[in-house]
C-alpha cells in the first residue's frame, strides 16, 4: 500500500539534486582556488542535514547554520551587486566584471540558484512530487528560508557604495515584496553603506524615460534615506551596449550615455 | 568606518595556550554580531567562532569546540578568542570581522598563530 504522502502546492524537488548540488560543489571548488579547501561532501550532508526528516513548513535560519560555516568566503564588501527580477543581465555582468559578486557568485548561492528541494517530516527521503509555495502554503519551506538567509548575510556584509540593478519594464521597478525589497534594503548597515545605487535597466529600445523618477524607485529613495543611507539612481537606456562597454570601455561609443 | 586591530598571535608549543585580541573602531560595536575567521598557509577562509552583539549566545567551529571560546567586552570594544590545547592545525593567520558570515571582507592585518614544537 503507497505510504500517504502531503500534497503541496509548489514543484517538487529538482531532480538529480543530490547530484547536481554535488557536482555543483566540485566545479566551484575548482574554478575557485581559494574555495579548494571546502570538502564538498561535507558541504552536502551539511545542506541535506537543513531539510531531510524536517516539516516543509517548519524550517528556520538555525537549520541552514552548519551549512553557513562551511560556505564562509571572503567577498570584498565595497563589490557587492544586488538584483531584483533581472538575474541574468545582473550575472551576465559580474561574468564580465570579474571583481564584483552577486549572490548567486558565491559558493552557497552557486550551490542552490534554481534549484528546488523539500524533505518529509520523519523520513530520509527527498520529496520529488511537490514542495511547498511560499503564498499557497507556507513562507517557512526550505528553499524560501535559505534565500532568506543568505540574502540577509549578504546583505549585512556590505559596504561603501552597493549597486542594485533593476528591471525596468516591470510595473513595479521596486517591489517592497521582491527578496531585494522585503530582506536586503532593510539588512544593508548603515554605518558600513554610504550609498545604495540603483541601475534601472530599460526594456524597449526606443524607450527614453527617466525610470529613476518612477514612483516605486521614489519609495526605494525613501526607505533608503531613512536608514541613512544616500541614494542615488541610473537609467541603463541600452543593456546590450551596457555590457559590452564593460567588456571594452576603450570603444569610441563608450563615452555617450547608456 | 569599520577598522579592527587584532593581536596576541605568536608562536606556541602544542598544548599550548593564547589569547587573542581584536579593538575595534568606526562603527557601534555593541551593535555588531562578531567572528573569528582564520587562513592557514596556501588554505581558504575557515570560520572558527562568532558571538551575538550581546555576548549572551556563542558558536564554534567543530574543529574547535571545547578548546576555544570567544568573548566580548562592549565596554572597551574588544572582541576576545581564547584559544587552549592548541594543535599544528591551528596554524594561521585569525582575523576578526564584524557580521556572523558566511560573507568576509576582513578590515584588519590578523595576527598570526604558529603552533610548532
Known amino acids: 500500500v503507497p505510504r500517504w504522502r502531503q500534497q503541496w502546492s509548489g514543484p517538487g524537488t529538482t531532480k538529480r539534486f543530490p547530484e547536481t548540488v554535488l557536482a555543483r560543489c566540485v566545479k566551484y571548488t575548482e574554478i575557485h582556488p581559494e574555495m579548494r579547501h571546502v570538502d564538498c561532501q561535507s558541504v552536502w550532508d551539511a545542506f541535506k542535514g537543513a531539510f531531510i526528516s524536517k516539516h516543509p513548513c517548519n524550517i528556520t535560519e538555525e537549520d541552514y547554520q552548519p551549512l553557513m560555516k562551511l560556505g564562509t568566503q571572503t567577498v570584498p564588501c565595497n563589490k557587492i551587486l544586488l538584483w531584483s527580477r533581472i538575474k541574468d543581465l545582473a550575472h551576465q555582468f559580474t561574468q564580465v566584471q570579474r571583481d564584483m559578486f552577486t549572490l548567486e557568485d558565491t559558493l552557497l548561492g552557486y550551490l542552490a540558484d534554481d534549484l528546488t528541494w523539500c524533505g518529509e517530516f520523519n523520513t530520509s527521503k527527498i520529496n520529488y512530487q511537490s514542495c511547498p509555495d511560499w503564498r499557497k502554503d507556507c513562507s517557512n519551506n526550505p528553499v524560501s528560508v535559505f534565500w532568506k538567509t543568505v540574502s540577509r548575510r549578504f546583505a549585512e556584509a556590505a559596504c561603501d557604495v552597493v549597486h542594485v540593478m533593476l528591471n525596468g519594464s516591470r510595473s513595479k521597478i521596486f517591489d517592497k515584496n521582491s527578496t531585494f525589497g522585503s530582506v536586503e534594503v532593510h539588512n544593508l548597515q548603515p554605518e558600513k553603506v554610504q550609498t545604495l545605487e540603483a541601475w534601472v535597466i530599460h526594456g524597449g529600445r526606443e524607450d527614453s524615460r527617466d525610470l529613476c523618477q518612477d514612483p516605486t524607485i521614489k519609495e526605494l529613495e525613501s526607505i533608503i534615506s531613512k536608514r541613512n543611507i544616500q541614494f542615488s539612481c541610473k537609467n541603463i537606456y541600452r543593456p546590450d551596449k551596457f555590457l559590452q562597454c564593460v567588456k571594452n570601455p576603450e570603444d569610441s561609443s563608450c563615452t555617450s550615455e547608456i | 568606518e569599520v577598522q579592527v586591530l587584532e593581536s596576541g598571535g605568536g608562536l606556541v608549543q602544542p598544548g599550548g595556550s593564547l589569547r587573542l585580541s581584536c579593538a575595534a573602531s568606526?562603527?557601534?560595536?555593541?551593535?555588531?554580531?562578531m567572528s573569528w575567521v582564520r587562513q592557514a598557509p596556501g588554505k581558504g577562509l575557515e570560520w572558527v567562532s562568532g558571538?551575538?552583539?550581546?555576548?549572551?549566545?556563542?558558536d564554534y567551529a567543530d574543529s574547535v569546540k571545547g578548546r576555544f571560546t570567544i568573548s566580548r567586552d562592549n565596554s572597551k570594544n574588544t572582541l576576545y578568542l581564547q584559544m587552549d590545547s592548541l594543535r599544528a592545525e591551528d596554524t594561521a593567520v585569525y582575523y576578526c570581522?564584524?557580521?556572523?558570515?558566511?560573507?568576509?571582507?576582513?578590515r584588519g592585518q590578523g595576527t598570526l598563530v604558529t603552533v610548532s614544537s
Open positions: 568606526g562603527f557601534t560595536f555593541s551593535s555588531y554580531a
Open positions: 570581522a564584524d557580521g556572523t558570515g558566511p560573507f568576509f571582507d576582513y
Open positions: 558571538i551575538s552583539n550581546s555576548g549572551g549566545s556563542t
